[in-house]
């Protein structure tokens, strides 16, 4: 029995921890009965052959965040009981081919964040019990065929952030038990057909942040157990029909940050378990009817930061469970009155940063549970009578940064806003843009003696022609000096009184959700 090395701490003798920059060589002697050894944040640069000979009971060895650059071939000799080995966050460039031959009972091997430039085909040949292999953050430019062939028990493999540009279609062919495969942050430009065919138990496939331009139509057809598929931040410009057809268990799909221009009807489905679909930051210009009709369990649909100028009236058919719909930061000028008709469970809709000039009075007709509507930074001059009357749960309505035209036609909206001011939040109220006589005044607290909707006379010098000369048709001209008589049967009725919402995010979408 050895005592604890002076530079280490030993709890119950079997757990040894050695940390600190003052350690420049492997501490010794180590307690013979040590079962867990952690060597962290030291300046150790080398691992000689004989340092673990007397601690054969060791189960877990964690040598992380050191300066380790060189490991002798026999360094792990006599560690037949070792189950968990981490050499992450060191400076390893190469590993001796036979380095792991005596630790053939390993279950986890963590080699992330080193400088490994290659893996020998025989490097992992004895690891039939290995469950997890982490190679994230190295410099592996390619993966040789056969390198994983003996890892038949592997369930988790991380090859992210290495910089390789292509994969052999046979590299994963013996990994039938693999559940998590992470290939993100590489430079893959295309993935050969068949690459994932052997991965029948795969649950997570992470391909985000590569340079993938096209997807083979049958690429995922053998991955019927896939639950999470990350394809974001690639160069995908087209989704082949049927690409997601064999994924009945998929519940999360990210496609944001690609170059998608269109979505063909039926491309998403059937995926009865999909809960979230992230499509923001693409180049989508329009949505056809039934674009998402097979996604009847979808709860979150993020389409912000695209170039949408047209949404077909039936684009959202079938999305009966949708809760969050993000359409902000697009080029929408008009919306069909039925576009949200099937979204009976919608709670939050974000339409800000578009070019909406008007909204149909029926746009929210069937969406009775709406809690937040974001309409700020659009081109709205007025809103139809009664557009929000039935929305008893509405808590947050953003209307600022629109060029509201405060003539007599605005009175019903003005009255409704007064009665429902709490719903506008406490930060910013809508303000009149025209006519010039009331510009800058709050639409909520402005005097009710609005000018009529007659054609305007000369404006003050500040006014450009762009926002202010587009007057309403002069069908009900009222002298601008006439006091407007309010009718008592305006369609803007009072809603249930609610307390002001102080926290803007209480009912709003998170930044992540809104894209």
């Amino acid at each position: 029995y050895y005592g604890c090395p002076s530079e280490c701490t030993c709890s119950r003798a079997s757990q040894v921890e050695c940390t600190g920059a003052q350690i420049v060589a492997m501490p010794s002697p180590l307690p013979w009965n040590a079962m867990s050894l952690q060597i962290l944040n030291t300046h150790i640069t080398e691992l000689p052959e004989d340092k673990f000979l007397n601690i054969s009971a060791l189960i877990a060895l964690k040598m992380e965040k050191n300066e380790l650059a060189n490991i002798m071939p026999g360094a792990f000799r006599n560690l037949g009981s070792l189950r968990h080995l981490s050499l992450a966050n060191n400076k390893l460039k190469n590993l001796p081919v036979r380095l792991f031959q005596d630790v053939n009972n390993l279950e986890t091997l963590l080699l992330s964040n080193n400088q490994l430039v290659q893996i020998q085909p025989a490097q992992f040949s004895q690891f039939s019990n290995l469950k997890e292999l982490q190679l994230y953050g190295n410099n592996l430019e390619y993966i040789p065929e056969g390198v994983f062939d003996h890892l038949v028990g592997l369930t988790k493999l991380n090859l992210g952030n290495n910089g390789f540009t292509h994969l052999s279609p046979r590299v994963f062919q013996h990994l039938g038990n693999l559940q998590v495969l992470r290939l993100y942050e590489n430079r893959l430009s295309d993935i050969p057909m068949g690459t994932f065919d052997a991965l029948g138990n795969l649950q997570e496939l992470a391909l985000q942040e590569n340079q993938i331009g096209t997807l083979s139509p049958g690429l995922f057809h053998n991955n019927r157990n896939l639950q999470r598929l990350y394809l974001s931040n690639n160069h995908i410009s087209h989704l082949p029909p049927g690409i997601f057809m064999q994924l009945p268990h998929l519940n999360k799909l990210t496609l944001f940050g690609n170059s998608l221009k269109e979505l063909s009807p039926g491309v998403f489905g059937p995926m009865p378990n999909l809960r979230e679909l992230w499509l923001y930051n693409n180049h989508i210009t329009s949505l056809p009817d039934n674009a998402f009709s097979h996604l009847n369990q979808l709860q979150v649909l993020i389409l912000s930061h695209n170039q949408l100028s047209y949404i077909s009236p039936g684009a959202f058919n079938g999305l009966t469970n949708l809760r969050e719909l993000s359409l902000h930061t697009n080029a929408l000028q008009d919306l069909d009155g039925n576009v949200f008709r099937s979204l009976a469970n919608l709670r939050n809709v974000s339409l800000q940063n578009n070019r909406l000039r008007q909204l149909p009075g029926s746009i929210f007709a069937n969406v009775n549970g709406l809690m937040t509507i974001q309409l700020q930074n659009n081109n709205l001059e007025n809103l139809p009578l009664g557009i929000f009357d039935h929305l008893g749960n509405l808590c947050e309505l953003r209307l600022y940064d629109n060029p509201w035209r405060c003539d007599s036609n605005i009175l019903p909206l003005h009255d409704w806003l007064i009665l429902n001011r709490a719903r506008l939040g406490t930060d910013t109220l809508p303000v009149c843009s025209s006519p010039a006589s009331v510009r800058g005044q709050s639409l909520v607290i402005i005097n009710v003696n609005f000018p009529g909707p007659s054609v305007q006379g000369p404006e003050t010098p500040e006014v450009s022609s762009y926002p202010d000369t587009s007057s309403y048709p002069d069908s009900t001209s009222i002298s601008s000096t006439t006091e407007i008589t309010r009718s008592t049967d305006d369609d803007y009725t009072d809603l249930n009184t609610i307390e002001p919402i102080d926290d803007r995010n209480t009912w709003g979408m998170t930044d992540a959700q809104s894209g």
Partner: antibody, heavy 121, light 107 residues
Framework: QVQLLESGGGLVQPGGSLRLSCAAS????????MSWVRQAPGKGLDWVSV????????FYTDSVKGRFTISRDNSENTLYLEMNSLRAEDTAVYFC??????????????WGQGTLVTVSS | IVLTQSPSSLSASVGDRVTITCRTS??????LGWYQQKPGKAPKLLIY???SLQSGVPSRFSGSGSGTDFTLTISSLQPEDFATYYC?????????FGQGTKVAIKR
């Protein structure tokens, strides 16, 4: 009449910071979006950033995202551009411009005369 | 979105009809404006929404087009029109200018 007066330009080393200001007068400042547009010496126009009338919406060109911040003080009728981690390619005359409406559109009916930012070691 | 103006420069005489084109790499509906800039001066808005004449701009200037192809026409070139002309799209962030077309006096 509408006036826009930029200030805050000058010589700065790469990696340095500057804060540009644009004092506005002659119009209801809070009811118009405002933008910054730059022009490198002898080159064309390059849109930099826009902010809506309330300041609630801001957008940037890709090359300045994370380095520049547009803001406005509607009580002081002033537009700002905070520029950090400046690079040689940021060298340009910076114009502030008034949009024709409160929401963010790229149609600017009044411009300042510009302030020169030089990034050089 | 990339905007490509043509020609990059042209020479014309007073009274000439001048046409400048702006082509966008993606469809932008009519979200395009035209600006005029003279040396040492700030730009001036001429046309917005592809074809609407800005207040105070002479009627000899006109704009047309939609989708990806846009045109600025000066029906009868005047001495004060010699300048550089830029198109700008604001359909999609980041907004982008064309590279400019310089209209010079023909010698």
């Amino acid at each position: 009449q509408v006036q826009l007066l930029e200030s805050g330009g000058g010589l700065v080393q790469p990696g340095g910071s500057l804060r540009l200001s644009c004092a506005a007068s002659g119009f209801t400042f809070s009811t118009f979006a405002m933008s910054w547009v730059r022009q490198a010496p002898g080159k064309g126009l390059d849109w930099v950033s826009v902010i809506s009338g309330t300041g609630g919406s801001t957008f940037y060109t890709d090359s300045v995202k994370g380095r520049f911040t547009i803001s406005r003080d509607n009580s002081e009728n002033t537009l700002y551009l905070e520029m950090n981690s400046l690079r040689a390619e940021d060298t340009a005359v910076y114009f502030c411009a008034k949009a024709v409406t409160v929401n963010t559109r790229g149609f600017f009916d009044y411009w300042g005369q510009g302030t020169l930012v030089t990034v050089s070691s | 979105i990339v905007l490509t103006q043509s020609p990059s420069s042209l020479s014309a005489s007073v009274g000439d009809r001048v046409t400048i084109t702006c082509r966008t790499s993606q469809v932008i509906r009519n979200d395009l404006g035209w600006y005029q800039q003279k040396p040492g001066k700030a730009p001036k808005l001429l046309i917005y929404d592809a074809s609407s004449l800005q207040s105070g701009v002479p009627s000899r200037f006109s704009g047309s087009g939609s989708g990806t192809d846009f045109t600025l026409t000066i029906s009868s070139l005047q001495p004060e029109d010699f300048a550089t002309y830029y198109c700008l799209q604001d359909n999609n962030y980041p907004w982008t200018f064309g590279q400019g077309t310089k209209v010079a006096i023909k010698r």
